[in-house]
Interface confidence: low
């Protein structure tokens, strides 16, 4: 903390301008009025202050606003935002999307810092849900943002926000996250026609149940292998050979390269070998011809 010292005669700052870069840290502390700084925060960004000088300016704002900065100041923090700790940010009440954008811009190009994560958390909690505009903004700055949320947090995403999600935003989502997002996407895109619907829903299919995959197989969608490999194993297992053939269309040939990997491996084990042979891909490991297949699922459900 900077020691309290009187401002030398003639050094009192009438405004925030470039002359302040020549002030020593103690002079900034003594000669810059905190209320003046708060009203002229937008000027700070244009002045090449050192990190040490920025520490002093932050200290002055902290003294002026011990309960947390007002949004009028927060919106103009600029590079001073990088000096804030998560503890500082937890005191803020950020409600304007413009404020959020301004601060995210400061951190642009860098990984999400603890400060940014806290800011986003405060903003989203303040809004009560991840609305479309917010999600649009966050994924623009951080494509992986959506997948950094827990399944519980994702449950607060309204289906309308799903329109803001791009395929790359889901790249790092795991199956449990897609389980939450898929039903929302299905709801969001339900009024689209077949081919358009598939384009939109494709990235979310890692959360799709068997009945939806069966329905898609009737729509001539030609799912690619990368998408198929991300499907839930338990959703793929009940599909018949004919359904998988229809689902993949010309991409069905790719099954051969994946025959030892889930979900293809487990699916093969559930198919009759003579059904697999109809694909002409040389897939091996199905149920030998002539074996009786008992469907125990009904018995298990009843016991």
């Amino acid at each position: 903390e900077v020691e309290k010292t009187a401002c030398p005669s003639g050094k009192k700052a009438p405004e925030i301008d470039e002359s302040l870069i020549f002030y020593k840290k103690w002079e900034l502390e003594a000669c810059v009025d905190a209320a003046l700084l708060a009203t002229q925060m937008d000027r700070v960004n244009a002045i090449p202050f050192t990190y040490e000088q920025l520490d002093v300016l932050k200290h002055k704002l902290d003294e002026l606003y011990p309960q947390g900065y007002p949004e009028s100041v927060i919106q103009h923090l600029g590079y001073l935002f990088l000096k804030m700790s998560p503890e500082d940010i937890r005191k803020w009440n950020v409600t304007s999307l413009e404020t959020l954008k301004a601060l995210l811009e400061v951190n642009k190009g860098h990984e999400m810092s603890p400060q940014v994560a806290t800011l986003i958390d405060r903003f989203v909690k303040g809004r009560g849900q991840l609305d479309k505009d917010t999600l649009d903004t966050l994924t623009a700055f951080y494509p992986g943002y959506l997948c950094s949320l827990s399944p519980e947090e994702l449950s607060s995403v309204p289906p309308s926000s799903i329109w803001a999600v791009r395929p790359q935003d889901l790249d790092t989502c795991d199956p449990r996250q897609l389980d939450v997002l898929y039903p929302k996407a299905r709801l969001a895109f339900q009024n689209m026609n077949g081919s358009e619907y598939f384009v939109k829903i494709q990235s979310f299919l890692g959360g799709a149940p068997t009945e939806d995959l069966k329905a898609l197989s009737q729509q001539n969608v030609s799912m690619d292998l990368a998408t198929f490999m991300k499907l839930r194993t338990d959703a793929v297992l009940p599909l018949t050979v004919a359904e998988v053939q229809k689902l993949l269309g010309p991409h069905v040939e790719g099954l051969k390269a994946e025959e030892r990997h889930r979900p293809v491996r487990d699916w093969i084990l559930r198919q009759r070998q003579d059904d697999l042979d109809t694909l002409g891909l040389g897939l091996q490991g199905g149920i030998p011809n002539g074996y009786l297949v008992l469907d125990l699922s009904m018995q298990e459900a009843l016991s």
């Epitope: 827990s150 199956p175 449990r176 990368a226 889930r262």
Partner: antibody, heavy 122, light 110 residues
Framework: QEQLEESGGDLVQPEGSLTLTCKAS?????????ICWVRQAPGKGLEWIGC????????WSASWVNGRFTISRSTSLGTVDLKMTSLTAADTATYFC??????????????WGPGTLVTVSS | AYDMTQTPASVSAAVGGTVTIKCQAS??????LAWYQQKPGQPPKLLIY???TLAPGVSSRFKGSGSGTEFTLTISGVECADAATYYC????????????FGGGTGVVVG
């Protein structure tokens, strides 16, 4: 026989960088599974670092990694690399690579390499 | 975050006895939990996955149970070869995670 083997462990100066390589033999690298890195400081527990998908190239990593460690893959060489920067003494550990056995149904690591030792010291 | 807490940190067992190790998740992880055994100088060995499924080649003396946030590994008919450190590992999510492993439990057979 499917096997993983780590290499590249070494004595490195603080603030230095090092790249470890996980070589997968008997595994088809154009197929879908995760290769993960786990480390263990001397006398301590297991610490997950992150994973790279061999097919989609997706990467997941622990929240503490903070960009210091990067996981990359080479399909042609059948390797997954762990590039470590700004190393400190706290990064001294045996580094294991492991294969996630169940791509879709939770994470578990059935196949492990023997490990490679990284020592950070001046 | 999904934090895994293992208890106890160490335990002693007599040959032929039973050992119980507990693992608690800070949030529900369904049944996505694995158990590993590690001996000095060796990599970990998968014992159990999805909370209760025995990995191939693992003795049926090892039993996993639990779901949600509470899990247990039970070793019955303890043998000298069971002396090792045991780790639980959540397999539920990999996003926003500090460490997927629990802190470990050392088992001493005497």
């Amino acid at each position: 026989q499917e096997q993983l083997e780590e290499s590249g462990g070494d004595l490195v100066q603080p603030e230095g960088s090092l790249t470890l390589t996980c070589k997968a033999s008997g595994l088809d690298f154009s197929s879908s599974y995760w290769i993960c890195w786990v480390r263990q400081a001397p006398g301590k527990g297991l610490e997950w670092i992150g994973c790279r998908h061999t097919f989609t190239a997706n990467t997941w990593s622990a929240s503490w990694v903070n960009g210091r460690f990067t996981i990359s893959r080479s399909t042609s060489l059948g390797t997954v690399d762990l590039k470590m920067t700004s190393l400190t003494a706290a990064d001294t550990a045996t580094y294991f690579c492991a294969r996630d056995e169940s791509n879709n149904d939770g994470w578990d690591f059935k196949l492990w390499g023997p490990g490679t030792l990284v020592t950070v010291s001046s | 975050a999904y934090d895994m807490t293992q208890t106890p940190a160490s335990v002693s067992a007599a040959v032929g006895g039973t050992v119980t190790i507990k693992c608690q998740a800070s949030q529900s992880i369904s049944n996505y939990l694995a158990w590993y055994q590690q001996k000095p100088g060796q990599p970990p060995k998968l014992l159990i996955y999805q909370a209760s499924t025995l990995a191939p080649g693992v003795s049926s003396r090892f039993k996993g149970s639990g779901s949600g946030t509470e899990f247990t590994l039970t070793i019955s008919g303890v043998e000298c070869a069971d002396a090792a450190t045991y780790y639980c590992q959540q397999g539920y999510t990999s996003s926003n995670v500090e460490n997927v492993f629990g802190g470990g439990t050392g088992v001493v057979v005497g």
